[in-house]
């Protein structure tokens, strides 16, 4: 059976978090999308594109930009002056439903923490890049940073579905609710979604 | 298993016209789009065009040395994608591979075995 | 259109020692710090494998002694230690934009 597992990444305050999250698959271009923090039963929607995504066309709420490029199948995600609080554990989403959320990769666990960054090339105000690719495997991708550039082997590119968990989490639990979380192959999920356009007929071509 | 089985090609006249056929199974189809890359012998790999998914309305880019003269269509309930070839020319002499890709701008992961076209008097 | 030019041409490596092939590119292939650059095999009478996507991604079932590297517009593709097997012509293309375009292939052949 395939697992999630959850990757941690430690930032300093201030610091900027950039995700690039990567749905590959045309039919998801104008799919609206969200960035969510799980807390408690559900996960907390933080940011979410237009219904449909409009291509390149940034959405902002407080610290968070969400920018979807349909062109290359891409969702950038920017969380700016990150905070102590901010720590927690993060998903981007294919969005439909709070309870059935589509994920497009394997959950960040975010971890802030107070004090000057004593990493390479970072600062109070830098940014720091996570590639996100979508995994069907329980292994955890490192971080990939712009500079320097390193080489990583990935995981088979397709979507993974997730039906989020309906019970309670924090960081001490998180991976043990991810492994009861429910996978849906691809296929299934061409049965499952009801295409964006013939909910809204609606393109960006 | 994904297969992608191409057909149609043989010999044909400068100025003639061809419809190559790509058979695919073994993935969903609606959902990728498909390519067709072509090899003159002993010549490098060139990329003829592709079609994009229903989704992106089933647009269609070319090369600059085919534009005009191939058209790439596919039909979802049959699993196929075809390239239409009009005003064919000597140099468009060449295996055509149908390629599928990985999705948006992905790369090529899976490929068929080719099908040969000669265009000669 | 984004022209890509590999080099060498062609390329004689003993066998265990290690190849470099290169691919340049025209204009920078990268969206988002994402290099849409990719690696092929071809060996006779075969259609090509893929070894490498997105410049740096092993394809799942390839030997990891193939490794690629780079961004922008400079690219390398690296066999550690050639195997008798890897000989073979070698494409780089890059689907960042459209058309899509090909290297113009690298033969190894061993030493």
């Known amino acids: 059976t395939t697992e999630l597992t959850e990757e941690k990444y430690e930032y300093k305050e201030g610091q900027t978090l950039e995700v690039k999250c990567d749905y590959t698959l045309e039919k998801f271009a104008s799919s609206q999308k969200a960035w969510q923090k799980m807390e408690g039963k559900m996960p907390k929607i933080l940011a979410k594109t237009e219904r449909p995504s409009e291509n390149s066309h940034p959405v902002q709420v407080g610290r968070i930009t969400l920018e979807d490029y349909h062109d290359h199948g891409l969702l950038q995600v920017q969380m700016t002056n990150l905070q102590v609080e901010d720590s927690g554990l993060y998903q981007c989403v294919i969005y439909q439903h709070p309870k059935e959320s589509h994920v497009l990769f394997n959950p960040i666990c975010l971890v802030v923490t107070k004090g000057s960054s004593g990493t390479p090339g970072s600062s109070e105000n830098s940014t720091q890049n996570v590639y996100r690719t979508p995994s069907t495997t329980a292994k955890a991708l490192g971080p990939r940073y712009t500079s320097p550039r390193t080489v990583t082997q990935a995981p088979p590119e397709s979507t993974v579905v997730v039906s989020t968990p309906g019970s309670e989490i924090n960081l001490t639990n998180v991976t043990d609710i991810i492994r009861e979380q429910k996978l849906i192959s691809e296929e299934d999920l061409e049965q499952k979604l009801i295409s964006e356009e013939d909910l809204h007929h609606h393109h960006h071509h | 298993e994904v297969q992608l089985v191409e057909s149609g090609g043989g010999l044909v006249q400068p100025g003639g016209s061809l419809k190559l056929s790509c058979a695919a199974s073994g993935f969903t189809f609606s959902t990728y789009a498909m390519h067709w890359v072509r090899q003159a012998s002993g010549k490098g790999l060139e990329w003829v065009g592709r079609i994009r998914t229903k989704s992106s309305n089933y647009a269609t880019y070319y090369a600059a040395s085919v534009k005009g003269r191939f058209t790439i269509s596919r039909d979802d309930s049959k699993n196929t994608a075809y390239l239409q070839m009009n005003s064919l020319k000597t140099e468009d002499t060449a295996v055509y591979y149908c390629?599928?890709?990985?999705?948006?701008?992905?790369?090529?992961?899976?490929w068929g075995q080719g099908t040969l076209v000669t265009v000669s008097s | 259109d984004i022209v890509l030019t590999q080099s060498p041409d062609s390329l004689a490596v003993s066998l265990g020692e290690r190849a470099t092939i290169n691919c340049r590119a025209s204009e920078s292939v990268d969206t988002f710090d994402y290099s849409f650059l990719h690696w092929y095999q071809q060996k006779p009478g075969q259609p090509p494998k893929l070894l490498i996507y997105?410049?740096?991604n092993l394809e799942s079932g390839v030997p990891d002694r193939f490794s690629g590297s780079g961004s922008g517009t400079d690219f390398t593709l690296t066999i550690s230690s050639l195997q008798a097997e890897d000989v073979a012509v070698y494409y780089c293309q890059q689907s960042n934009e459209d058309p899509y375009t090909f290297g113009q292939g690298t033969k190894l052949e061993i030493k």
């Open positions: 390629t599928r890709d990985m999705g948006i701008r992905r790369q090529f992961a899976y």
């Open positions: 997105r410049a740096s």
